[in-house]
Interface confidence: medium
């Protein structure tokens, strides 16, 4: 004597108060988990969206983005404009990163160049409004005895002094 | 949490009874799955009718026992089973129950002429 | 209506052994709407299995439930004195008339 509304399975809901307990989800709707009192509606893929996955009768439809959009927020809930690398989007569109910042990605914000001097470090390759600047070795890396690339000096046996 | 079933009773052919389940610790104004079954003596369980309290949603009955047989919610803690043009193959003890898993003593109602 | 039909009465067993009890549905049970009862003389029903195979709260491992569609089985092993009760099967069908049917009941006994 199970309450049966409760233990309708996935793809159906409980429709009671006609000749089934438990009735198909009608189409374009959908109830992923049992004991459902309503199906819910599919989700539609229009305009800048398109389907990545069709709804089901237990599982409803997944969108993404047409080319030239990405997708963001929860299950693809928004679709925002690409720009090109060394551009973020604007109210009033795409708009070149100013000098000082880049942007790798179709998608994101312009952000400052890493301060190479901030790790005592210097710029080994300048920044791009696309590309990162590539910090190099610290200045005195550079001085003579100082690389971790010069062998070390042969060990000295002790009491013997330098010559 | 226990229910209750009262109101069995001795009655002629043709009589009418009301059988009333009681509910301690269950607020049937919430949504639950309530049935009556019965069990005529030395024999087994026969199942009546099933209603959802709390809702107005079509009870459920065996084909023998509709439009003779009315299960309804009367209160907050009450379920009932009305029964019409009673017969001696009615004769048995009426148990109450909620989703299978808590049920009443029971009830016996006699039909006897 | 539905008809459920189960291992005939009585079965007799022993302390410590297993028991099967089969039950056979007229129409597929909807969903695995299926549950097993015990009941012992002047008592309620108690439900040990549901959704087929789904152990009730407090009841003890040694009560099986398997089986989908029209066939279904209870199975008791280490058998105990107390499990000597007439066991009941009960299908769900997707009609809001006759929903539920019960088995004609099989006693355990022990020999």
């Known amino acids: 004597l199970q309450d049966l509304c409760s233990n309708c399975p996935a793809g159906t809901f409980c429709d009671n108060n006609r000749s089934q307990i438990c009735s198909p989800c009608p189409p374009n709707s959908f109830s992923s988990a049992g004991g459902q009192r309503t199906c819910d509606i599919c989700r539609q893929c229009k305009g800048v969206f398109k389907t990545r996955k069709e709804c089901s009768s237990t599982s409803n439809a997944e969108c993404d983005c047409i080319s030239g959009y990405h997708c963001l927020g929860a299950e693809c809930s928004m679709c925002e404009q690409d720009c090109k690398q060394g551009q973020e989007l604007t109210k009033k569109g795409c708009k070149d990163c100013c000098f000082g910042t880049f942007n790798d990605q179709k998608r994101g914000i312009c952000r400052p160049w890493t301060n190479c001097s901030l790790d005592g470090k210097s710029v080994l390759v300048n920044g791009t409004k696309e590309r990162d600047v590539v910090c190099g070795p610290s200045p005195a890396d550079l001085s003579p005895g100082a690389s971790s690339a010069t062998p070390p000096a042969p060990a000295r046996e002790p009491g013997h002094s330098p010559q | 949490e226990s229910l209750e079933e009262s109101g069995g009773d001795l009655v002629k052919p043709g009589a009418s009874l009301t059988l009333t389940c009681t509910a301690s610790g269950i607020d049937f104004s919430r949504r639950y799955y309530m049935c009556w079954v019965r069990q005529a003596p030395g024999k087994g369980l026969e199942w009546i009718a099933c209603m959802y309290t709390g809702s107005r949603d079509t009870p459920h009955y065996a084909s023998w026992a509709k439009g003779r047989f009315t299960i309804s919610q009367t209160s907050s803690t009450t379920v009932t089973l009305q029964m019409t043009s009673l017969t001696a193959a009615d004769t048995a003890t009426y148990f109450c129950?909620?989703?299978?898993?808590?049920w009443g003593p029971g009830t016996l109602v006699t039909v006897s002429s | 209506a539905q008809v459920l039909t189960q291992t005939a009465s009585p079965v007799s067993a022993a302390v410590g052994g297993t028991v099967t009890i089969n039950c056979q549905s007229s129409?597929?049970?909807?969903?695995?709407?299926f549950s097993w009862y015990q009941q012992k003389p002047g008592q309620p029903p108690k439900l040990l299995i549901y959704?087929?195979?789904t152990l009730a709260s407090g009841v003890p491992s040694r009560f099986k439930g398997s089986g989908s569609g029209t066939q279904f089985t209870l199975t008791i092993s280490d058998l105990e004195c107390d499990d000597a009760a007439t066991y009941y099967c009960a299908g769900g069908y997707n009609t809001v008339t006759d929903t539920f049917a019960f088995g004609g009941g099989t006693e355990v006994e022990f020999k």
């Open positions: 129409q597929s049970v909807y969903s695995n709407w």
């Open positions: 959704s087929a195979s």
């Open positions: 129950a909620r989703e299978g898993n808590l």
